[in-house]
């Protein structure tokens, strides 16, 4: 079937997920499109431990994640509940700032140089991280 039991080439396995780290930038929607074509999604950060893992791999570089509020409320791309989930915003963020002069506010979340999150204009060409979960069935211990 289509179940994934190990990570593809050039992806990094961590805690039963696979991660791919870009080395160049795209707008949020185009990064999202890239991940989806690879049967993945922009990274969804669900714990401090996952935050530190991603932060270690991306370094001090603005990097898109799978969090946006383009349709109103903040939403994770995989449906993970935002309100009750892990958050790591910078102080005073998100602020939906309109002062950048690019039109509109700021609807897409990214890791900043210190790893904490900021909302920014979705058209900015930032690096991104894709994530895909390994097949849940493969987590079961083998039958003896």
């Amino acid at each position: 079937g289509s179940e994934r039991t190990c990570c593809p080439v050039n992806w990094v396995e961590h805690e039963r997920s696979c991660y791919w780290f870009s080395r160049s930038g795209k707008a949020w929607a185009d990064a999202d499109n890239y991940c989806r074509l690879e049967d993945a999604h922009l990274v969804v950060v669900t714990s401090w431990e996952e935050q530190k893992f991603v932060q270690h791999h991306i370094g001090p570089v603005n990097t898109w994640m799978g969090l946006h509020d383009q349709n109103g409320p903040w939403k994770w791309v995989d449906g993970t509940d935002y309100e009750t989930g892990f958050k790591n915003w910078r102080p005073e963020q998100p602020d939906d700032w309109y002062g950048h002069g690019l039109g509109g506010g700021e609807d897409c979340a990214h890791f900043t140089d210190d790893g904490r999150w900021n909302d920014d204009v979705c058209q900015r060409p930032y690096r991104w991280v894709c994530e895909t979960e390994l097949d849940k069935a493969s987590q079961e211990p083998p039958l003896l």
Epitope: S24, Y34, E38
Partner: antibody, heavy 122, light 107 residues
């Protein structure tokens, strides 16, 4: 041999339907996104549709949205394009292509079939 | 949608000469640009990706350069088999798009 072979093209009247197939061999078909690209006679190349590895994500050019359906069968190493409500402007050679990825995050067509001609005319 | 404009439309050269093909994007595509070669009756073939990286099996006489909006494909010394149509393609912004092509013909 690493190759893609398209079939299913032909002459069809406006409003008609066709189903194109693409048979893959020589590589792990189930590990790559795939696309259809077309080329009208004497014209340039136009992306038509993309499909992710397990078909969980599908995308279409505006010009074919709602009329064409892309699908794949990884067990059969095959890619398909169902074309309905065909128009004269859909006349083209249709190529299937493998979508290769790069470390920078680019998607490029690193393997192409030889194409199949679709002619829409009354 | 990003528009890619290729120039010249036709390039008439002799074998052994240097060919310089241009591709200009309507907005920045960073380095997400590829070049393809297509001979009559054949499928396109990937030559260059990420603006400057040669695809597997492509001879060293083909080179790509540029970033942002201006890109160049150079064929250092034309071989008889290089006379064909060349297309650029961007994968920076959705939808991915192709240029209109440059035909390299024998002078």
């Amino acid at each position: 041999e690493v190759q893609l072979v398209e079939s299913g093209g032909g002459l069809v009247k406006p409003g008609g339907s066709l189903r194109l197939s693409c048979a893959a061999s020589g590589f792990t078909f189930s590990s790559y996104p795939m696309v259809w690209v077309r080329q009208a006679p004497g014209k340039g190349l136009e992306w038509v549709s993309s499909i992710s590895i397990s078909a969980s994500y599908i995308d279409y050019a505006d010009s074919v949205k709602g009329r064409f359906t892309i699908s794949r069968d990884n067990a059969k190493n095959s890619l398909y394009l169902q074309m309905n409500s065909l128009r004269a402007e859909d006349t083209a050679v249709y190529y299937c292509a493998k979508l290769g990825t790069t470390v920078s995050g680019g998607h490029y067509f690193d393997l192409w079939g030889r194409g199949t001609l679709v002619t829409v005319s009354s | 949608e990003i528009v890619l404009t290729q120039s010249p439309a036709t390039l008439s050269l002799s074998p052994g000469e240097r060919a310089t093909l241009s591709c200009r994007a309507s907005q920045s595509v960073s380095s997400y640009l590829a070049w393809y070669q297509q001979k009559p009756g054949q499928a396109p073939r990937l030559l260059i990706y990420d603006a400057s990286k040669r695809a597997t099996g492509i001879p060293a006489r083909f080179s790509g350069s540029g970033s942002g909006t201006d890109f160049t494909l150079t064929i250092s010394s034309l071989e008889p088999e290089d006379f064909a149509v060349y297309y650029c393609q961007q994968d920076s912004n959705h939808p991915l798009t192709f240029g209109g092509g440059t035909k390299v013909e024998i002078k």
